[in-house]
């Protein structure tokens, strides 16, 4: 059995990707320059470390987290890297055009790379719902549309709702989840007879998925604190995220055992639930004043995550065609919503405490912000799904879903691996 792309895609992918890369290079040539201001090297290194943490989260963490399929682990990791590399380039340009362009040129700083990496992370969260059912050419489209939609959402939220970088980037969880789910809903769903085993997890890929989860777990405090303005805010965000993810690990493992009739622990639950606390405290990580509150939120998030992993996959598989092990989409949609609700509850408590109508107005604004993020995610996701269904992309046939051999050369294997 030949391990090649169909001829048409073999022509389409390199042409499409390299033309796009050439266009990006030209845009960088004409419209960008580096920040030439004086910076001391020590400060520069410290600032770079946050960006490095985010890159590790994206490339290794999310790359390996999605690699648990028996026959699709290579593609999961490599396609994630491809999307990250492309997404960061486009996000830097887009953020620059949206926020700086009136001044003539886009100035690239370490902060803009940090922002771009976080924008690209959105795609890596979303793509979990469609990996295995799309080829690289389709993923390029998904990267471009999603990064563009997120960039515009952030600009609109910043201008209309007066939110800072941290607050508008923390919509990433909800945005990415709903974007991914709506793309998945548009793609062909049924797995034909005989291919069901491909979307099952295997021991070694599951181990690499756990490795991904560990990297995400270690670096989640960096993600939640990356865009905060002062050391005191960042310190609180790091502490609270750490407490929340620590408790969500304990909750995930014990909750997974509790949810199983024989008390066994599910790998799939644990992969995802260990991150629950970090997502749930994301929006308000710097606002939580004491460890016990962060820990309670981590506990609740862990329970919701395990509960969701137990009861939602059936529904997601039926309605959206998402395999049981791809639980990041609905996990993040639940936990992202929980995080947003926690922030809104803090505002409501302010309103009650102050008896101030203006703070009540802030609650409405926050609900409006969340609603806008969900609406834009769903609309842009549906648009992407429709685009991905176009014949020009030569999508893999349903019988070839979740199969590395469709995309990779395995000289030592004739069939399967």
């Amino acid at each position: 059995m030949s391990s090649k792309y169909p001829r048409s895609v073999r022509r389409c992918l390199p042409l499409w990707a390299l033309t796009l890369e050439a266009a990006l290079i030209l845009l960088f040539y004409f419209f960008t320059h580096y920040d030439a201001s004086l910076e001391d090297q020590k400060g520069l290194v410290a600032s770079y470390q946050v960006g490095q943490d985010l890159t590790v989260m994206a490339a290794i963490g999310l790359g390996f987290l999605t690699s648990s399929f028996r026959r699709h682990s290579w593609s999961s990791v490599a396609f994630n890297l491809f999307m990250l590399a492309l997404g960061v380039q486009w996000a830097i340009l887009l953020d620059g055009f949206l926020s700086q362009f009136p001044s003539g040129k886009v100035v690239i700083t370490l902060f803009s790379i940090r922002l771009a990496t976080m924008s690209a992370l959105s795609v890596l969260i979303s793509v979990d719902a469609v990996l295995g059912k799309v080829n690289l050419a389709q993923l390029v489209v998904m990267v471009l549309v999603e990064v563009t939609a997120l960039g515009n959402l952030r600009m609109v939220i910043s201008n209309i709702f007066n939110t800072d970088y941290h607050m508008n980037m923390m919509h990433i969880y909800v945005f990415a989840a709903y974007f991914g789910l709506s793309v998945a809903w548009c793609l062909p769903k049924p797995l034909p007879e005989g291919t069901e085993d491909k979307d099952q997890t295997a021991t070694i890929p599951s181990l690499s998925a756990m490795l991904g989860a560990l990297f995400l777990w270690m670096f989640w405090p960096s993600f939640n604190s990356a865009l905060l303005r002062s050391p005191i805010e960042r310190k609180n965000a790091v502490f609270n995220t750490y407490y929340a993810v620590a408790v969500s690990v304990v909750t995930a493992i014990s909750g997974s055992s509790l949810a199983h009739p024989q008390g066994k622990i599910s790998k799939t639950y644990v992969h995802s639930a260990v991150l629950a606390g970090g997502v749930a405290v994301g929006t308000s990580c710097h606002l939580i004043p004491s460890p016990w509150l962060a820990m309670v939120l981590g506990l609740v998030a862990g329970l919701i995550s395990v509960g969701g992993a137990k009861y939602l996959p059936g529904c997601c598989n039926r309605v959206l065609g998402i395999p049981h092990s791809s639980i990041m989409g609905y996990n993040f949609s639940l936990l992202g919503l929980l995080g947003e609700i926690i922030y809104i509850v803090l505002l409501v408590l302010d309103t009650v405490g102050a008896g101030n109508g203006m703070i009540g107005f802030q609650v409405l604004l926050s609900i409006g912000e969340l609603s806008l993020a969900i609406v834009i995610a769903l609309m842009s996701g549906l648009l992407t799904g429709l685009l991905l269904n176009l014949k020009i992309w030569k999508a893999p046939h349903e019988a070839k879903y979740f199969d590395d051999q469709v995309f990779w050369k395995f000289p030592h294997l004739a069939v399967g691996f």
């Epitope: 002062s230 004043p289 803090l346």
Partner: antibody, heavy 129, light 108 residues
């Protein structure tokens, strides 16, 4: 004691460049964001730019965007403002100021309040042909 | 951007008078408002932050109030050293910090 000292002001022709410096002492410079604020003769205060404590992020007023660049060297405890393409309307006293933050909390939430708590004595920039 | 409007732009008062300066924001800024005092030829000085909290070392005759869009700076008993220009400043809409146009307090 806590102190900020600006330097580098002077008379310059329109279209030319100038670089202002602000030397900080008496506090941990690398833990604070820093601002430039200006005041045209007989006018009010106008915020110009801010840089985060680690230099990772910078913001500018629309009136100077693309012409002015704020930077810092934490190893030298110094803040800079590079001013290019100067115009007559840039004539002002330029102050550097420390971005101070304080936190208050109740049982469920932190509140962060910012202010400019330490100011330099100012340096005068005159743009004239 | 958020606009800050101070009133009056100047006022004359005598030592011992109670003085009130108001500041209005073009949209709600919660309590994210500061008051500064600037004497001629000097740098500004932070008086009040978070709309109503006195910065350390500031005399208790100064007080601030308000939330949302309307704020007030009150000097309960004007002293000779209080004759200066007062500015309000919002920082709700970061990354831009906006000052009011200033209120000059002069000796009657």
């Amino acid at each position: 004691q806590v102190q900020l000292v600006e330097s580098g002001g002077g008379v310059v022709q329109p279209g030319r460049s100038l670089r202002l410096s602000c030397a900080a002492s008496g506090f941990t410079f690398s833990s604070y964001g820093m601002h430039w604020v200006r005041q045209a003769p007989g006018k009010g205060l106008e915020w110009v730019a801010v840089i985060w404590y680690d230099g990772s992020n910078k913001y500018y007023a629309d009136s100077v965007k693309g012409r002015f660049t704020i930077s810092r060297d934490n190893s030298k405890n110094t803040l800079y403002l590079q001013m290019n393409s100067l115009r007559a309307e840039d004539t002002a006293v330029y102050y550097c100021a420390r971005d101070w933050v304080t936190r208050s909390s109740n049982w469920y939430r932190n509140y962060y309040y910012y202010g400019m708590d330490v100011w330099g004595q100012g340096t005068t920039v005159t743009v004239s042909s | 951007d958020i606009q800050m409007t101070q009133s009056p732009s100047s006022l004359s008062a005598s030592v011992g008078d109670r003085v009130t300066i108001t500041c209005r924001a073009s949209q709600s800024i919660s309590s994210y408002l500061n008051w500064y005092q600037q004497k001629p030829g000097k740098a500004p000085k932070l008086l009040i932050y978070a709309a109503s909290t006195l910065q350390s070392g500031v005399p208790s005759r100064f007080s601030g109030s308000g939330s949302g869009t309307d704020f007030t700076l009150t000097i309960s008993s004007l002293q000779p050293e209080d004759f200066a220009t007062y500015y309000c400043q919002q920082y709700y809409r970061t990354p831009t910090w906006t000052f009011g146009q200033g209120t000059k307090v002069e000796i009657k």
